[in-house]
Structures are given as structure tokens and as C-alpha cells.
């Protein structure tokens, strides 16, 4: 089948990094500067993404792959392939349409992005509060109050809600 297809369609022989040039008798021509083709058999090359403004280049464009962008300091990526850059806030804050706002009492945000979330209500899961919450940290729930009787073995507190610098959202 492959052989038959290549006999019928000479473009199928054009590798990534080239395009099938109709203006030149369907010869495989290299992609022009600032363009790429990531698969073979393409009749055009795609324009390279340009990382401008708040975007910065994480990976340069090549003849076979598009450029990749990330965000300048103070911003973080949003969306597939970092399609947007969103302002960072501090831990203990959330980004609203009016900018960064401190978390209200009883809520926390341990990231530079995302919402202020209510502290976990340990009692709803049959547990007790081991470590109180702050604006930057969720409460840490421990064993149920009944488990804390004298002689009960000590419990290692669970890890904090999320590691700073990692996006849960």
C-alpha cells in the first residue's frame, strides 16, 4: 500500500522539514526560514510561533518543530502549549479580575496561582485538626479524636497540601 501510495502521490515522499512544492513540479523543498513541517507529505509549512511580550522562548523553532514559549518572571503559563500568560500572586492570595487579593480567614492558597480554598473540615472526614490552617496552608488533619487516646501510636502528619511551585489547578 505504501508503495502504491508513493507512486500515486509523490508528496508522500517529502520528509518532515520540507513541503511538496506544487510550483516546482511537486519537488520536496525545504521549509523557508521561520516555518516548519513536523510530519512528512505536507503541501505547506506552518509559520513558527513567535514568543513576544510577556512570552519568552523556551525552545527555538526548527524546520521540523514549532517554537515553544513560556512566561517571563512574575507570570505563569495557562492553557495548552502555554497559550496565555497569567500574573502570579503570592501564596496566601488569589488572582481576581481586580488583581491579587489576600485570602479571607478560613481559606488558603499555597500557590502563586489559583483560588483561595476553604480549609479542609477535618471533622467531616471523621478526623481532627493536627495543624491549624493559615492563609498559605490548609489545615493538616490527623487521626479521629477517638484514636488520640493515651497509648495510641503517634502519627506522622501528611504532606502539605501541595508543593510550592507545582500547579495543581
Amino acid at each position: 500500500f505504501e508503495r502504491t501510495r508513493s507512486l500515486q502521490d509523490p508528496c508522500s515522499n517529502c520528509p518532515a522539514g520540507t513541503f511538496c512544492d506544487n510550483n516546482r513540479n511537486q519537488i520536496c523543498s525545504p521549509c523557508p526560514p521561520n516555518s516548519f513541517s513536523s510530519a512528512g507529505g505536507q503541501r505547506t509549512c506552518d509559520i513558527c510561533r513567535q514568543c513576544k511580550g510577556v512570552f519568552r522562548t523556551r525552545k527555538e523553532c526548527s524546520s521540523t518543530s514549532n517554537a515553544e514559549c513560556d512566561c517571563t518572571p512574575g507570570f505563569h503559563c495557562l492553557g495548552a502549549g502555554c497559550s496565555m500568560c497569567e500574573q502570579d500572586c503570592k501564596q496566601g492570595q488569589e488572582l481576581t479580575k481586580k488583581g491579587c487579593k489576600d485570602c479571607c480567614f478560613g481559606t488558603f492558597n499555597d500557590q502563586k496561582r489559583g483560588i483561595c480554598r476553604p480549609w479542609t473540615n477535618c471533622s467531616l472526614d471523621g478526623k481532627s485538626v493536627l495543624v491549624n490552617g493559615t492563609k498559605e496552608r490548609d489545615v493538616v488533619c490527623g487521626p479521629s479524636p477517638a484514636d488520640l487516646s493515651p497509648g495510641a501510636s503517634s502519627v506522622t502528619p501528611p504532606a502539605p497540601a501541595r508543593e510550592p511551585g507545582h500547579s495543581p489547578q
Epitope: 495557562l78 492553557g79 497569567e86 488572582l95 481576581t96 479580575k97 481586580k98 479571607c104 481559606t107 496561582r113 489559583g114 483560588i115 476553604p118 479542609t120 473540615n121 467531616l124 472526614d125 490548609d138 489545615v139 493538616v140 488533619c141 501528611p158 504532606a159 502539605p160 497540601a161 501541595r162 508543593e163 507545582h166 500547579s167 495543581p168 489547578q169
Partner: antibody, heavy 120, light 106 residues
């Protein structure tokens, strides 16, 4: 490829409990909150709560507090929703949904749903 | 608790523009997300953060949000757009959905 695969349909008697599972694959399970949403026949979407897969921290809708427990098993990349004291009004399709990255909390990927029927 | 109000149904002819509204007190200050749900299927996110489209969602889908109303606009409506549409916001401690709007393509 990102996927959330839920356990199969359940039929329960009033007063019983049901536990629905949601296995995640194709992404870092510990990095995204997991939510549960239900939909009664012919009705709209109703949020039940979330679990932080990294810490196990939870938040429940007031309506379900005391009846719902959302947990996770990080080693199995699976979230669970248990609903107790079932009544006929709990007959619904239950969805798990991954929290996305947008400002203000969106749900970007959903499981296929699990039908729970409560009938005597 | 915060409430979101959607019209139960909207009808539109193929090729025309459908507008589905979502009302809420000062909703313009919140981020609104929209989901499409076809019969027997799970919801699919079609608009997030008022007006952004996830990859794979056609450009025909757009959103806006100001004042007390958010709007999902579907231009050049196709038969395949027939579905239920839900708006959603985050309000202090809970995720809130609108009641849903059934879009019928005539």
C-alpha cells in the same frame, strides 16, 4: 492521552452506601484537584465536592456534608466518592471531573459517568 | 448562596447565531465557564475564563461576561451543536452551575 475512567453502574437499596471510583491516566494525578458532580435524570449538574489528591484535603457542598466522603489512592491514581444513607432522590449519574487551570476554577476533563440507581 | 439563571431553552436555525445567557449578581466580577452536554454523554468544557476556548473547540464558540450577565455565543450554528449548555462559576466555597439551557437546532 488524558483519561478518567469510572467504575460501572450500581443498584442500591435505600439506606445503603455506594462507592464510585475514578481512575486517572495520562497526567500527573497528584497535581490536579478532583471533583465530583452528579446529574439526576432529566436534571442539571450538581457539584458535590473535591479532593486534593496530594494531601487528601477535601471540601464538600453543604447539601452533602455528613453523607459524602471523597478520598483518593495516589498509588493507584484513583479518586473515590462514597455516598451513604441513600434515598431514591440520589438516583443519578455521578461524574468525576479534573479541575483545570483557569482563573476561577473550571473542570476541564470529565469521566464517562456512573449511573447509581436507588430502588427498593 | 450564589445562583445562576439560564433560559430553559433556545431555538435557532442552522447557520444562524445562538446566544445563551447566564445571569447572576455581579457575575462580571467572576470567571464564567461553559459546558456542552449531548444526550448520554459527559459534559465538555467549551469556554473557560469568560471567553477562552480549549484546544479542539471551534472558533464559532465565543463568550463574554459583564455586569449581571454572561453570554455564550455560537455562530453559524450546526446540527451537531444541539445539546444542553451549562454555565459555571466558583463562589467562595462551592462550585455553582446554572440550570442549563437546551439548544435546539431547527
Amino acid at each position: 492521552q488524558m483519561q478518567l475512567v469510572q467504575s460501572g453502574a450500581e443498584v442500591k437499596k435505600p439506606g445503603a452506601s455506594v462507592k464510585v471510583s475514578c481512575k486517572a491516566s495520562g497526567y500527573n494525578f497528584g497535581g490536579y484537584y478532583m471533583h465530583w458532580v452528579r446529574q439526576a435524570p432529566g436534571q442539571g449538574l450538581e457539584w458535590m465536592g473535591w479532593v486534593n489528591p496530594k494531601s487528601g484535603g477535601t471540601n464538600y457542598a453543604q447539601k452533602f456534608q455528613g453523607r459524602v466522603t471523597i478520598t483518593r489512592d495516589t498509588s493507584a491514581s484513583t479518586a473515590y466518592m462514597e455516598l451513604s444513607s441513600l434515598r431514591s432522590e440520589d438516583t443519578a449519574v455521578y461524574y468525576c471531573a479534573r479541575e483545570g487551570e483557569a482563573v476561577g476554577l473550571d473542570l476541564d476533563y470529565w469521566g464517562q459517568g456512573t449511573l447509581v440507581t436507588v430502588s427498593s | 448562596s450564589y445562583e445562576l439563571t439560564q433560559p430553559p431553552s433556545v431555538s435557532v436555525a442552522p447557520g444562524k447565531t445562538a446566544r445563551i445567557t447566564c445571569g447572576g449578581n455581579n457575575i462580571g466580577s467572576k470567571s464564567v465557564h461553559w459546558y456542552q452536554q449531548k444526550p448520554g454523554q459527559a459534559p465538555v468544557l467549551v469556554i473557560y475564563y469568560d471567553s477562552d476556548r480549549p484546544s479542539g473547540i471551534p472558533e464559532r464558540f465565543s463568550g463574554s461576561n459583564s455586569g449581571n450577565t454572561a453570554t455564550l455565543t455560537i455562530s453559524r450554528v450546526e446540527a451537531g451543536d444541539e445539546a444542553d449548555y451549562y454555565c459555571q462559576v466558583w463562589d467562595s466555597s462551592s462550585v455553582v452551575f446554572g440550570g442549563g439551557t437546551q439548544l435546539t437546532v431547527l
